[in-house]
Interface confidence: low
Amino acid sequence: QPPPPPPDATCHQVRSFFQRLQPGLKWVPETPVPGSDLQVCLPKGPTCCSRKMEEKYQLTARLNMEQLLQSASMELKFLIIQNAAVFQEAFEIVVRHAKNYTNAMFKNNYPSLTPQAFEFVGEFFTDVSLYILGSDINVDDMVNELFDSLFPVIYTQLMNPGLPDSALDINECLRGARRDLKVFGNFPKLIMTQVSKSLQVTRIFLQALNLGIEVINTTDHLKFSKDCGRMLTRMWYCSYCQGLMMVKPCGGYCNVVMQGCMAGVVEIDKYWREYILSLEELVNGMYRIYDMENVLLGLFSTIHDSIQYVQKNAGKLTTTIGKLCAHSQQRQYRSAYYPEDLFIDKKVLKVAHVEHEETLSSRRRELIQKLKSFISFYSALPGYICSHSPVAENDTLCWNGQELVERYSQKAARNGMKNQFNLHELKMKGPEPVVSQIIDKLKHINQLLRTMSMPKGRVLDKNLDEEGFESGDCGDDEDECIGGSGDGMIKVKNQLRFLAELAYDLDVDDAPGNSQQATPKDNEISTFHNLGNVHSPLK
């Protein structure tokens, strides 16, 4: 039994501090007590802490830790969430413009093919949007369907406009002939190659960004173990039990504790680094036929060329098809009846190239540069959190978990902790199931990113498992987005003008007093915050 404390040795300071954590003083002793029931802040003498206080300190310590982790990841989380939304929207806008350019090409050059062509073009670009967002659609089928649908209209409206209505029954025959006679030359094949390569890469890029968000969200909301809670309590609060209110934990001690608490999280580091580097490799290869902006915005030109190719061969085609499809009601069309490769386009086809000053590719590179500054995010977390919580500089006159020391010694601290619990054991437990799951997902996306990276390897036709979403932002009035020039061709302007659509904001003063749950750590992309702020790739 320790001797009673001198009359002036009260727990007044501890009481006033604890009241800020927990209103009411029923748990705080008025004068120091033996504290034999304490399990974390094991006393060397009389203490101003009770078991109930200790429990409250543990809860507060774990909450503090969660908040520190969330504020540590705030900037990174905001960067990825904002960019995922911006790129997704930008890709949808590219699709919308590509559709509008294609519709305008038909309207200006082949007015007799509208509105059927608009319908087929609309369906094609809806499929493009769905594909980008993960829907299980085959790109070759999309392109084939576009040309299969267009050819009967081209044949009946442009090549043989005098056909009676009853002859419209030949549509199925014409669809079949389209492929077997290669009526569009190699243009459909060219479009398949360009579109599939560029869309696969775009899709994996979006999928990777969405997974990045999931990684941050997972680690952002980790619940720390009781062991970690005890370590944090000992570091941040046990000094109060001895009346040492102004003492800060030793920096070295903080690092040891944080490494213990975050051992599982730090295991993500290797895969996170690989994720950023693989994403960089993907982005570096997203040009020419691997750049959906370049490919889709040039499609109108390739489709135009393909129709001109048909027109050039109209004479031979009309004769051949006239014979083949004249009695299509009587007999089924059979590809075996017709010579293969009747009209093969021998000339080398150039990729339609759209000139513009600045494109999404520069935005992607900008994002990668910013992401690379977070490449050590997970390995640096313990140090970051210690540097953003109160610690004593130079490890002098600081708290080591048990007492005030003049200089921190890791060995002494470890020895002192042995009876309480083993730091090494905490590290050995391995990552939590949610962390293991996110590591598996990172491994999977890294594998995908590696197989998709250009130009080293071929783009594999992977069926990615992200779900699809219809773009839905397409105005069907093509004149709203683009005007045809006098000669019937379309001038493609700097594409960043349409990205301006993404930068509009909903002014915060539109929502007076609307601050529920809006803490500084919540600075993510939001309908109620200016998208053009902070890390906006539109600035």
């Epitope: 995922a84 993960g134 968000i213 979403f469 932002d473 929502a511 309908t527 109620f528």
Partner: antibody
């Protein structure tokens, strides 16, 4: 195909609580702001809650502020609306709706709705 | 809050006729960024609302071209060039220029 499926509606007494859920599929849920919109028996539509893509920012009109809480679980692709201190004027069909990806969005897709009846 | 007023409350039409619905806001819907966030939704009997037109005149994907939107400032109109049976239902206008977003009271399009 985009799908939003609400559940959790039912009959509740004034002052009671109810939690609605909305399961989303067919789109990248994690990058979309989401809302709850209700339709009164008189068929008037009222926007009752908004939550940003990552779940950090929320908004409520004065009529429900302090009583309703919107939340989301991006891992489960699910949106929630916790309603407490319910009043008879909260009786309505509750729809969850995805905002377009653009800021100041419009409600691009709606669920089929779940009916909440507040009555003694 | 911005009040959205729709007229008429009910609109009886014959199939094939043109229909016109008006929507007026209590304050201008032109945002400081120049955009006007006025949208139209259709709710068919027994269904949830569906987006038809966004930002005054842009048709949402899959919406037939017989639907068109126009207007500026505080006065807006939805026109259906040739009403078809599938167009029947309640039409709502909505604004998202000002927080909170608000809806009009609805216009019921029905067969004469």
């Amino acid at each position: 195909e985009v799908q939003l499926v609400e559940s959790g509606g039912g009959l509740v007494k004034p002052g009671g609580s109810l939690k609605l859920s909305c399961a989303a599929s067919g789109f990248a849920f994690i990058t979309y702001g989401m809302s709850w919109v209700r339709q009164t028996p008189e068929k008037r539509l009222e926007w009752v809650a908004y939550i940003s893509s990552g779940g950090a920012n929320t908004y409520y009109p004065d009529s429900v502020k302090g009583r309703f809480t919107i939340s989301r679980d991006n891992a489960k692709n699910t949106l929630y609306l916790q309603m407490s201190s319910l009043k008879s004027e909260d009786t309505a069909m509750y729809y969850c709706a995805s905002l377009s990806t653009l800021v100041r969005g419009w409600f691009a897709y709606w669920g089929q709705g779940t009916l909440v009846t507040v009555s003694a | 809050d911005v009040v959205m007023t729709q007229t008429p409350l009910s609109l009886p039409v014959s199939l094939g006729d043109q229909a016109s619905i008006s929507c007026r806001s209590s304050q201008s819907l032109v945002h400081s960024n120049g955009n006007t966030y006025l949208h139209w939704y259709l709710q068919k009997p027994g269904q949830s609302p569906k987006l038809l037109i966004y930002k005054v005149s842009n048709r949402f994907s899959g919406v037939p071209d017989r639907f068109s939107g126009s207007g500026s400032g505080t006065d807006f109109t939805l026109k259906i060039s040739r009403v078809e049976a599938e167009d029947l239902g309640v039409y709502f206008c909505s604004q998202s220029t000002h927080v909170p977003y608000t809806f009009g009271g609805g216009t019921k399009l029905e067969i004469k």
